[in-house]
Amino acid sequence: RKAVLDCEAMKTNEFPSPCLDSKTKVVMKGQNVSMFCSHKNKSLQITYSLFRRKTHLGTQDGKGEPAIFNLSITEAHESGPYKCKAQVTSCSKYSRDFSFTIVDPVTSPVLNIMVIQTETDRHITLHCLSVNGSLPINYTFFENHVAISPAISKYDREPAEFNLTKKNPGEEEEYRCEAKNRLPNYATYSHPVTMPSTGGDSCPFCLK
């Protein structure tokens, strides 16, 4: 391998296309993201440029380490596509396109409870709905902070429903639900709803 001024002396396999990636692929508007442009050849003095469509967003150089471009996704059109150009003197190669998926975060869901009380049992129906947020939304129901349902996926703006039957409890139970969509590490919870213990008219949700 010679230290040469003319990059055209390089073989194609010595200078393949760069790779453009981000740890975060699903984002919400206003989110800050980091994009990484890297190259397999760790010996070359590479100049990396980032583009969104035809707009030049920035340039960095690096050898043996990726270029890191920090961006803020504020508008829908900023989802992409992004391209990274790696240049060594007069040689340049482009990465594949990379696009973010912009997802509206879920708002705190509302939990509604309906109970049919019999002498021995309570038949409980839990409804959970988040009125805002990109679909699909996964709902999970909790009793006393323990998940009691699998994730229920809703592809429409209809409440998730979960039924359970319980022996009339002697202690009050607390229910809440979680709403989550494709935004990683972003889940919202309903206000807790407390079911009182049996006795008297202490079941405000009950249909008798």
Epitope: L5, C7, L44, Q45, Q60, D61, G64, T89
Partner: antibody
Framework: EVQLVESGGGLVQPGGSLRLSCAAS????????MIWVRQAPGKCLEWIGI???????YFANWAKGRFTISRDNSKNTVYLQMNSLRAEDTAVYYC???????????WGQGTLVTVSS | DIQMTQSPSSLSASVGDRVTITCQAS??????LSWYQQKPGKAPKLLIY???TLASGVPSRFSGSGSGTDFTLTISSLQPEDFATYYC?????????????FGQGTKVEIK
């Protein structure tokens, strides 16, 4: 023939300014990172700074504020502007492009700058 | 900021001797180090780059080793044309202010 020629050196008074040129022939400087290096008489090589292919410049701490590097791609030339010159800036000044691996391989013959009253 | 400390500053040797020059970086620079030979009144000449890769046209008696902070240039059998001053040049992987520096040089003289 591929070569670099530095020019613009000479005698200058303390406090004066000088602009050195580094012209390339036989190849285009446009896409190359260019560094400036100097060597005082009988002393070691000293890195001054670099201009990237995308026109960003970086300097040794001692050169910041007094020295600037620019490039004119249409003239295939890189410049070193030196202001507020001092006696200790007396040296031979070299330019060199980085090769594809990021090392200066091709050097000019240098241009001598003498700062004296 | 990067500083390169080269040693020894000078050495006397005879033709045929094995000569070793060391260079230490103030911070880790991976393998981003090159070695240069300079003769009086001449521009530097690249010998080694990437710490251990021999530059084009350089005799194989020259070799380089090291990574991180400690680097070595070795001349296995000193020849008459090798009497010169040798410099290391260290750099970070990304261009930055004060991100490149030469060592102080090692003058190899005839004993």
């Amino acid at each position: 023939e591929v070569q670099l020629v530095e020019s613009g050196g000479g005698l200058v008074q303390p406090g004066g300014s000088l602009r050195l040129s580094c012209a390339a022939s036989g190849f285009s400087l446009n896409n190359y990172f260019m560094i400036w290096v100097r060597q005082a008489p009988g002393k070691c090589l000293e890195w001054i700074g670099i201009i990237t292919s995308y026109h960003t410049t970086y300097f040794a701490n001692w050169a910041k504020g007094r020295f600037t590097i620019s490039r004119d791609n249409s003239k295939n030339t890189v410049y070193l502007q030196m202001n507020s010159l001092r006696a200790e800036d007396t040296a031979v000044y070299y330019c060199a492009p980085y090769d594809i691996y990021g090392y200066p391989t091709l050097w000019g013959q240098g241009t001598l700058v003498t700062v004296s009253s | 900021d990067i500083q390169m400390t080269q040693s020894p500053s000078s050495l006397s040797a005879s033709v045929g001797d094995r000569v070793t020059i060391t260079c230490q970086a103030s911070q880790s620079i991976g393998a981003y180090l090159s070695w240069y030979q300079q003769k009086p009144g001449k521009a530097p000449k690249l010998l080694i780059y990437e710490a251990s890769t021999l530059a084009s046209g350089v005799p194989s008696r020259f070799s380089g080793s090291g990574s991180g902070t400690d680097f070595t240039l070795t001349i296995s059998s000193l020849q008459p044309e090798d009497f010169a001053t040798y410099y290391c040049l260290g750099a970070y992987g990304r261009s930055s202010d004060d991100g490149t520096a030469f060592g102080q040089g090692t003058k190899v003289e005839i004993k």
